[in-house]
């Protein structure tokens, strides 16, 4: 057989669909590999083949386009399952060519079973509210193209196990859902059952989605440094190990990069010579919020050590900031009977 | 999880000393503000003292200035409050608890607390 | 020092009451964008419990029903619907700059 371009086993998209639901899977060959789309493919006289292979096959084998009431079916750029069944999990590849170019690519597709509860192993997508930010809605996902505009469907949410009705703040509208106003006890598993008709069978959607509510823009500030601060003295004699913990608050913000660094004496410790250890641990707050932290550790300080400037620096989306550490050695305690016998006129 | 575990319950004679214990687990000890705090039977909260574990600093309220000192063994995440000079009205449960960290830069609270000690003074 | 005053110092109430709980401090314990002023609850034998931070930040874990709000001086706890778990013994606490805390007397929430 000709060569053909092989984008291999594309495990970046793993399909999850629930079972005895429909599924539409667009070949991911128009979507992330090549620079053209199916029309345009279609029309220069390329055709588009589907094939499988079968969990634990090896075997490719053609799909079965035959089945009762067309279960499986081809539409342009897309495979139809009316519903999907269990054992349709396998990897499916789909082949663009004619007679003088070739390309396919392959992906994973599992049926998922869930419970009455909408629990799954399937992975959710998450959605992030604002907390206590004024009204907030999420969209019941992925249901373009089941069904045409003139077919109006019915849309019961759930909120875990329970149908949202009567709710203090979460409000069903149709393919949307609303938070009047977002709180921490609005965090959970959303599900939308999408019902609607088509040639005489009914078809249900199940969408879920988690809801994390995280902190509001508007309580968001630079980071705080909170250690190294004015209060607290690294006081060390010569050969002691100096630890000095860099502790800085972020708040949350939507896509910023939080980093905490360290200077010495203006270097970033990769760039000196004194043997300086960093460890960094990074905690959550329940809304997201970063508390960073990173221990410079020198083992066996010097005198020279105690001489330089420690500055810990923090910078997220909303500013930078810096403090420096309070370091300074410590003066050795008199011994009595020299030193001291000496101030009080002792001779 | 964070956990602050105190040593048992304590019977001192007057005038002399007390060392309370609070071992730390579950979070990075030395990053922390140490907190003691009081209560006398029947009575509010009253708070003591402070120690930074990664310096050893240490703040004393007016108070038990002189008669208190703070320590800390980073090698067993412990802080140690000791009183001395006991007096019958020193009889309460000591509590250590940690200093939270926020999105403000002072002004902290105390989001985790020990299970108390009970030191008693009586002759 | 700062002084807290905490009002009343007994408060009786039945399951599903509004609770109130006021404290007001000798200054302001408020800067720019927070207060630091913090409440807790101890149940007899019990270590206390953080409820609100910041003078209205909710502590993870700790039941909506549950309310602070104030600046300056006067601050207020609100338990919107008393439950049976919540009859216990209330503190404010203000931490005004390292290196002074300070509580409040306590208000004793009972069962009417």
């Known amino acids: 057989s000709e060569r053909c371009d092989d984008w291999g086993l594309d495990t970046m998209r793993q399909i999850q669909v629930f079972e005895d639901e429909p599924a539409r899977i667009k070949c991911p060959l128009f979507e992330h590999f090549l620079k053209f789309n199916y029309s345009t493919a279609h029309s220069a006289g390329l055709t588009l083949i589907w094939y499988w292979t079968r969990q634990d096959r090896d075997l490719e084998e053609p799909i079965n386009f035959r089945l009762p009431e067309n279960r499986i079916s081809k539409e342009k750029d897309v495979l139809w399952f009316r519903p999907t069944l269990l054992n349709d999990t396998g990897n499916y590849t789909c082949m663009l060519r004619n007679t003088t170019y070739c390309s396919k690519v392959a992906f994973p597709l599992e049926v998922v079973q869930k419970d009455s509860c909408f629990n799954s192993p399937m992975k959710l997508p998450v959605h992030k509210l604002y907390i206590e930010y004024g009204i907030q809605r999420i969209t019941c996902p992925n249901v373009d193209g089941y069904f045409p505009s003139s077919v109006k469907p019915t849309i019961t949410w759930y909120m875990g196990c329970y149908k949202i009705q009567n709710f203090n703040n979460v409000i069903p509208e149709g393919m949307n859902l609303s938070f009047l106003i977002a709180l921490i006890s609005n965090n959970g598993n959303y599900t939308c059952v999408v019902t609607y008709p088509e040639n005489g069978r009914t078809f249900h959607l199940t969408r879920t989605l988690t809801v994390k509510v995280v902190g509001s823009p508007k309580n968001a500030v630079p980071p705080v440094i909170h250690s190294p601060n004015d209060h607290v003295v690294y006081e060390k004699e010569p050969g002691e190990e100096l630890l000095i913990p860099c502790t800085v608050y972020f708040s949350f913000l939507m896509d910023s990069r939080n980093e905490v660094w360290w200077t010495i004496d203006g270097k970033k410790p990769d760039d000196i010579t004194i043997d300086v250890t960093i460890n960094e641990s990074i905690s959550h707050s329940r809304t997201e919020d970063e508390t960073r932290t990173q221990i410079l550790s020198i083992k066996k300080v010097t005198s020279e050590d105690l001489k330089r400037s420690y500055v810990c620096h923090a910078r997220s989306a909303k500013g930078e900031v810096a403090k420096a550490a309070k370091v300074k050695q410590k003066v050795p305690a008199p011994r009595y009977t020299v030193e001291l016998a000496c101030g009080f006129g002792a001779t | 999880e964070v956990q602050l575990v105190q040593s048992g319950a304590e019977v001192k004679k007057p005038g002399a000393s007390v060392k309370v214990s609070c071992k730390a687990s579950g979070y990075i000890f030395i990053t922390y503000w140490m907190n003691w705090v009081r209560q006398a039977p029947g009575q509010g909260l009253e708070w003591v003292g402070q120690i930074f574990p990664a310096s050893g600093t240490t703040y004393y309220a007016q108070k038990f200035q002189g008669r208190v000192t703070m320590t800390v063994d980073t090698s067993t995440s412990t802080v140690y409050m000791e009183l001395s000079s006991l007096r019958s009205e020193d009889t309460a449960v000591y509590y250590c608890?940690?200093?939270?960290?926020?999105?403000?830069?002072?002004?902290?609270?105390?989001?985790?607390w020990g299970q108390g000690t009970l030191v008693t003074v009586s002759s | 020092d700062i002084q807290l005053t905490q009002s009343p110092s007994s408060l009786s109430a039945s399951v599903g009451d509004r609770a109130t709980i006021t404290c007001r401090a000798s200054?302001?314990?408020?800067?720019?964008?927070?207060?630091?002023m913090h409440w807790y609850q101890q149940k007899p034998g019990k270590a206390p419990k953080l409820l609100i931070k910041y003078a209205s930040d909710l502590e993870s874990g700790v039941p909506s029903r549950f309310s602070g709000s104030g600046s300056g001086t006067d601050f207020t706890l609100t338990i919107s619907s008393v439950q049976p778990e919540d009859f216990a013994t209330y503190y404010c606490?203000?931490?005004?700059?390292?290196?002074?805390?300070?509580f409040g007397q306590g208000t004793k929430l009972e069962i009417k």
């Open positions: 608890a940690r200093t939270d960290f926020y999105r403000y830069e002072g002004g902290y609270a105390l989001d985790y």
């Open positions: 606490h203000h931490s005004w700059g390292i290196p002074m805390y300070t």
């Open positions: 200054q302001s314990v408020s800067t720019s964008g927070y207060s630091s």
